[in-house]
Amino acid sequence: PEPPTACREKQYLINSQCCSLCQPGQKLVSDCTEFTETECLPCGESEFLDTWNRETHCHQHKYCDPNLGLRVQQKGTSETDTICTCEEGWHCTSEACESCVLHRSCSPGFGVKQIATGVSDTICEPCPVGFFSNVSSAFEKCHPWTSCETKDLVVQQAGTNKTDVVCGPQDRLRA
């Protein structure tokens, strides 16, 4: 008969035979034969394989290097890689999170739209009319100008995106 040219899911073709792939968490030691099943062995400590595979070596777990501002978010298993994240105040430079940078601060005139996480930087937005920010901050949002009217005061100095309004007493000489 014709040897197989394709195999079922979780199998692979070798020497005209369909062999079982090794399950996640195990590596290939020897291919199946006509009379024997594929031989697989569990990955060692600090190793993993996350798919059905025919790999002869397991992958090393990612190292979360504290010198790069990294720490372990989720410990790896024989079937999953370690997930790194950044120390407080830092965020990843890429999706793979191989290094960290300090969270960006929003300059005066800008406020925090979205606070940074371990994997995303601060998102700043310009303070719209009626709002201001007079500090460089990674946490402060734009604050609304003070409402002089509610304090029975009048605006003595208009506010900007960087400064609050200055309120003062009403002019009592005015009719």
């Epitope: 008969p1 199946c32 034969t33 009379f35 024997t36 099943e37 031989e39």
Partner: antibody, heavy 123, light 107 residues
């Protein structure tokens, strides 16, 4: 009932030939690998060879001690296995068993055996 | 070829005894190890395949264990019908090879 019955054994001179037969019943003969195993008087078991099933093209494998001298064949229409033995030697003297070879990749084994037929090679 | 060494070659035991037969392969056979029982003048009979799986109809007093190169057949409580010769056989690599046999005799 699953059964294997050998025949054809006897006395033969060194250098001579003999053909053994094994009649199978009680199972779908063409689905199985079939084997010959021999046992010299008072000794252990020795695998001689096998013939694969229909799905695997009825190809054969032999032990080094008989390769080129012995031929295994089968007639699936008659449910019969054969062992053609040529250039026989004194050391081929043994009881010859026909055996069904079964199993999966989680382990193959000789699960059905015939009663055996004695082959004596002597002058 | 893979050599199969059985020990002991013979043993004497009484009915009710626990009997252990060992089989050592010359290389790792990954549990592809079968056991057969043979009585005088009869054909061998399959007892256990793939190290520990009993063939249908085989009494539970027969059990197999082992891994790598070392395997064991145990008869937990020897019965009169168990006096016979026992052979191991590796099914990992051609040519299939058998152990030399262990003859279990009545003490």
């Amino acid at each position: 009932e699953v059964q294997l019955v050998e025949s054809g054994g006897g006395l033969v001179q060194p250098g001579g030939s003999l053909r053994l037969s094994c009649a199978a019943s009680g199972f779908t003969f063409s689905d199985y690998y079939m084997s010959w195993v021999r046992q010299a008087p008072g000794k252990g078991l020795e695998w001689v060879g096998f013939i694969r099933n229909k799905a695997n093209g009825y190809t054969t494998e032999y032990a080094a001690s008989v390769k080129g001298r012995f031929t295994i064949s089968r007639d699936n229409s008659k449910n019969t296995l054969y062992l053609q033995m040529n250039s026989l030697r004194a050391e081929d003297t043994a009881v010859y068993y026909c055996a069904r070879y079964g199993g999966l990749r989680q382990g193959w084994y000789f699960d059905v055996w015939g009663q055996g037929t004695l082959v004596t090679v002597s002058s | 070829d893979i050599q199969m060494t059985q020990s002991p070659s013979s043993l004497s035991a009484s009915v009710g005894d626990r009997v252990t037969i060992t089989c050592r392969a010359s290389q790792d056979i990954r549990n592809y190890l079968n056991w057969y029982q043979q009585k005088p003048g009869k054909a061998p009979k399959l007892l256990i395949y793939y190290t520990s799986r009993r063939d249908s109809g085989v009494p539970s007093r027969f059990s197999g264990s082992g891994s790598g190169t070392d395997y064991t057949l145990t008869i937990s409580s020897l019965q009169p019908e168990d006096f016979a010769t026992y052979f191991c056989q590796q099914g990992k690599t051609l040519p299939w090879t058998f152990g030399g046999g262990t003859k279990v005799e009545i003490k």
